[in-house]
C-alpha cells in the first residue's frame, strides 16, 4: 500500500497560521477571512542523512498545490523557498532529496523543523504579521520556531 502524506494546519504560539501569498509562504493571524495552508508531511525513506537526535526526516508540501519547501543558499545565507514539486515525487525517490528535507522534532506539544542541508537553521515566523516564513539560526525572543500541527479533516 502506497504511503500518504499526513495533513495539518500549522499555527504558532501567537495564533499565526501559514498562508500562501503568490508563490511564497507568509504568517498571518488565524482569522475567518484568511485561508491557511494545509501542510503535507511525509517521512523520507532513505536514511542517508538521518540523525535521530535531531528528529525524523520529512518532506513538507502544500496540500492541493505541487509546491514543496526547500532550502537553498542565496547570497551566502540559507533561505527557505517553495519549489514546484509534488511531495509524492520526492517520497518515491530512492535517494533522499537533501534540499527538501527537514528534521521534524517534537518539543512538548510543539513541532520544530530544522533544515537537513543547513544544520542549526530552523523554520521560523517573525513576531510581525504578514512576514514571510523563513530560516533562522536564532531561536527565541524575536523568532518563533515552535509550531502546533493541528489535525484537519
Amino acid at each position: 500500500r502506497e504511503a500518504a502524506p499526513k495533513s495539518y494546519a500549522i499555527r504558532d504560539s501567537r495564533q499565526m497560521v501559514w498562508v500562501l501569498s503568490g508563490n511564497s509562504l507568509i504568517a498571518a493571524p488565524l482569522s475567518r477571512s484568511i485561508k491557511p495552508v494545509t501542510l503535507h508531511l511525509i517521512a523520507c525513506r532513505d536514511t542517508e542523512f538521518s540523525d535521530k537526535e535531531k528528529g525524523n526526516m520529512v518532506y513538507l508540501g502544500i496540500k492541493g498545490k505541487d509546491l514543496c519547501l526547500f532550502c537553498a543558499e542565496i547570497q551566502g545565507k540559507p533561505t527557505l523557498q517553495l519549489k514546484e514539486k509534488n511531495i509524492m515525487d520526492l517520497y518515491v525517490e530512492k535517494k533522499a532529496q537533501k534540499p527538501f528535507l527537514f528534521f521534524h522534532n517534537k518539543e512538548g506539544s510543539t513541532s520544530v523543523f530544522q533544515s537537513v542541508s543547513y544544520p542549526g537553521w530552523f523554520i521560523a515566523t517573525s513576531t510581525t504579521s504578514g512576514q514571510p516564513i523563513f530560516l533562522t539560526k536564532e531561536r527565541g525572543i524575536t523568532n518563533n520556531t515552535n509550531f502546533y500541527l493541528d489535525s484537519v479533516e
Epitope: M16, P29, S31, S33, I34
Partner: antibody
C-alpha cells in the same frame, strides 16, 4: 451539543487559593482544535480573560494574573480546572468557563458555562 | 483599563438603529485578528452574538451585524427591541499579550 458546568466553593478566605473545575459534556476535552478558557466578571464590572488551555495541553495566561494562575486538564474526568493563589477581595467575581475551536470560531468563545460566584472574604 | 475600548453606554428608542464601537490597536484588531461580540442579558452568562467580525451564529437575528476596519470594529443593531437591553462586549486576540482581550462593555438601554 457541547455543555460546560463550573463547580467549586463559593467562599474563599483571603491569601488562600481559589479552585474551580469546569466539567465538559457532549464532547471530549481532548478533541482536536478545541481551546478552553476561564473568564471572570467582578460584580457590576466587565469581562476579564484569566487564561486558557487547549487540546494540546498548551496554556496561555493573562500577563496581569500569570504569577498566580494555573490551568490544567483532567482527561479522565473530562474536566479542566483553575487555581488562583493568594486571593484578595479584588478576586471576588463570577467565574465562567468557555470554549471555542481553532479554524471554526477563530479565537472566540461560542460555548459558556452559566458561571459561579466566588466571594473572597474572611 | 481594558485593552479594547467601548463606550460605557448607548441608548435608542424601539425600532431605531444603534451602533457600538470597539477600538483596539496594532497588536490586536489592527493586526487582523477577528473581533467577536457577546450579548449579556441581566443575570445570565455572555452569549456569542457575532464571530469572525461579521458572522452570526445560528439563531441570532439578522438585526445584529458586525463590521471591522483598521483598528476598530462596530456592532449595529437595527429595529431595536426591548429584549435587546443588555450589556455588549467585543473581544479579540492580542499577539503582544499572547492572549484574549475584551472591551470594557457597553450597556444598551432601550428607551
Amino acid at each position: 451539543e457541547l455543555q460546560l458546568q463550573e463547580s467549586g466553593p463559593g467562599l474563599v478566605k483571603p491569601s488562600e487559593t481559589l479552585s474551580l473545575t469546569c466539567t465538559v459534556s457532549g464532547g471530549s476535552i481532548t478533541a482536536s482544535n478545541y481551546y478552553w478558557g476561564w473568564i471572570r466578571q467582578p460584580p457590576g464590572k466587565g469581562l476579564e480573560w484569566i487564561g486558557s488551555i487547549d487540546y494540546t495541553g498548551s496554556t496561555y495566561y493573562n500577563p496581569s494574573l500569570k504569577s498566580r494562575v494555573t490551568i490544567s486538564v483532567d482527561t479522565s474526568k473530562n474536566q479542566f480546572s483553575l487555581k488562583l493563589s493568594s486571593v484578595t477581595a479584588a478576586d471576588t467575581a463570577v467565574y465562567y468557563c468557555a470554549s471555542g475551536k481553532y479554524y471554526e470560531t477563530y479565537l472566540g468563545f461560542d460555548v459558556w458555562g452559566q458561571g459561579t460566584l466566588v466571594t473572597v472574604s474572611s | 483599563e481594558s485593552v479594547l475600548t467601548q463606550p460605557p453606554s448607548v441608548s435608542g428608542a424601539p425600532g431605531q438603529r444603534v451602533t457600538i464601537s470597539c477600538t483596539g490597536s496594532s497588536s490586536n484588531i489592527g493586526a487582523h485578528y477577528d473581533v467577536h461580540w457577546y450579548q449579556q442579558l441581566p443575570g445570565t452568562a455572555p452569549k456569542l452574538l457575532i464571530y469572525g467580525n461579521d458572522n452570526r451564529p445560528s439563531g441570532v437575528p439578522d438585526r445584529f451585524s458586525g463590521s471591522k476596519s483598521g483598528t476598530s470594529a462596530s456592532l449595529a443593531i437595527t429595529g431595536l427591541q426591548a429584549e435587546d437591553e443588555a450589556d455588549y462586549y467585543c473581544q479579540s486576540y492580542d499577539y503582544s499579550l499572547s492572549g484574549y482581550v475584551f472591551g470594557g462593555g457597553t450597556k444598551l438601554t432601550v428607551l
